[in-house]
């Protein structure tokens, strides 16, 4: 009798040791109990975000177990009947009604610890959890609106010239996307049946001194930033103004070449007549290097090869960003 002096875990409400398996405890409430006993009897509710796949511990009010009569946990999950887990101290019995989720349990024996634990939190655990403690001084409540958080998968890629796409896939709640520097952006949200949301932001930068852009994804589970270099995509549509220098340059070069050719034709006619039949071949040889150059580099030429190059660039950019 009284031989062992307890750490008040037996005498108080919970045992810290039992929280070793929990990666997030929903017991740490910034709000203090209200100031007098009559107000303490009023219900205290807390909205609590918790990451998916972690373990969570929910606490009752700070009532000494020695002074308890009944502890009841009421669990209301979306689309399910209300589940109750109760413990009666006088008879030392526990009772459950409509409780099917085996991951929601007492942390330990309820006569030692009134906490409730959720092992490996899933999206389906979104809901309202309430501890009701019946004591000689009345009923004390502590309720939690549990919001399960899902970290979105973030990707960033360039899909057109000076246009980038940032995606936050399957987050809960929806992530917020911002850009540095700001561009001309359009954001779309896609809602999934499991409660997650995909956010897609597409931005275009007209200003040419912008070479690197950063996509910043804000979420309750943490923030993430990815950056990308805006590479000029070969074969992509360009405005008419951008083509003018190329056109003028081409005309000038063609004019000069044509003029030289005419000079050659007129000034060397007698000389050419004395040559063999192979002259046109020589002429073609002289022109070949230039012809091949213009074909490979002039955007006015057929762009079939350029489209293939653009596709190659696209996959290259994707791969690089996934490794960030």
């Amino acid at each position: 009798e009284g031989a062992a002096q307890p750490n008040n875990s037996l005498m108080l409400q919970t045992s810290k040791e039992n929280h070793a398996l929990a990666s997030s405890s929903l017991c740490m409430d910034e709000k203090q109990i209200t100031q007098n006993y009559s107000k303490v009897l009023a219900e205290v509710n807390t909205s609590w975000p918790v990451k998916m796949a972690t373990n969570a511990v929910l606490c009752c009010p700070p009532i000494a177990l020695r002074n308890l009569i009944i502890i009841t946990w009421e669990i209301i999950l979306r689309g399910q009947p209300s589940c109750t887990k109760a413990y009666k101290k006088e008879t030392n019995e526990t009772k459950e009604t409509n409780c099917t989720d085996e991951r929601i349990t007492w942390v330990s024996r309820p006569d030692q610890n009134s906490d409730l634990q959720i092992r490996t939190v899933a999206i389906t655990h979104d809901g309202y959890y309430r501890c009701i403690m019946v004591t000689p001084d009345g009923n004390f409540h502590r309720g939690y609106h549990l919001q399960v958080l899902v970290t979105p998968e973030v990707t960033l890629f360039q899909n057109r010239n000076r246009t980038a796409v940032c995606k936050a896939v399957a987050g809960k709640p929806a992530a917020h996307i911002s850009w540095i520097p700001e561009g001309d952006c359009a954001t779309k949200q896609e809602y999934w049946s499991n409660g997650t949301v995909t956010v897609k932001s597409t931005c275009h930068w007209e200003v040419h001194n912008v070479s690197t852009v950063t996509c910043h994804v804000s979420h309750l589970t943490g923030n993430k930033s990815l950056y990308i270099e805006l590479l000029p995509v070969p074969g992509a549509k360009k405005s008419a103004k951008l083509y003018i220098p190329y056109i003028i340059l081409t005309i000038i070069i063609l004019t000069i070449v044509g003029f030289i050719w005419l000079l050659k034709v007129n000034g060397c006619r007698k000389y050419k007549l004395n040559k063999t039949e192979s002259t046109p071949v020589v002429e073609e040889d002289e022109m070949q290097p230039y012809a091949s150059y213009t074909e490979k580099n002039n955007p006015l030429y057929d762009t079939t090869n350029k489209v293939k190059a653009s596709e190659a660039l696209q996959s290259e950019v994707d791969t690089d960003l996934h490794t960030l």
């Epitope: 009284g2 008040n8 108080l12 002074n67 004591t135 004390f140």
Partner: antibody, heavy 119, light 112 residues
Amino acid sequence: QVQLVESGGGVVQPGRSLRLSCVASGFTFSSYGMHWVRQAPGKGLEWVAIIWNDGSNRYYADSVKGRFTISRDNSKNTLYLQMNSLRAEDTAVYYCARDRIVGAGFDYWGQGTLVTVSS
Amino acid sequence: DIVMTQSPLSLPVTPGEPASISCRSSQSLLHSNGYNYLDWYLQKPGQSPQLLIYLGSNRASGVPDRFSGSGSGTDFTLKISRLEAEDVGVYYCMQGLQTPWTFGQGTKVEIK
């Protein structure tokens, strides 16, 4: 209103015994844990013992363990402290106090009874 | 055992002026349920102790709002915003996290 009235104090010789009583009123005695706390003359407060509402658990300060016994009679709304092998250092005012439901302290105290251990 | 240390041990205060008492514990009083198991009691001359503050910062019923408690873990403070004559006495902090319950040595507040 809640009232706690201690009795049984007095002058006693070292090594002798004494039994203190605390009669409770104004609340459902059988629903609350009860404590004894003492205060030596001119000194601070020292917790002595606790008993649960149903008497199922009792805990003691090291200084009195094995010598003092806390008990209760819920039918009489009375708390007891049986003090054996008394020592001079047990001289103090002894208060009974009601265990507070919220947290882990004392919400109501008796007026105290003085125990003097002297030869 | 958890050791409670109060300072100052004596505090002369002019009526209407504020007063502040510090209490330090040898280990954290923050329970895993998020509450600090620290109480403040006042023992007026010739009387039994009375509860002022529970769970670190919650005023007990009937306690004037000039009394406030703050702190977490191992460091706690009791503040009296404007001292009144009836506030004189010895103030004790007490931890209820572990048995045995332990008190500070007490701070005697008196009129200057």
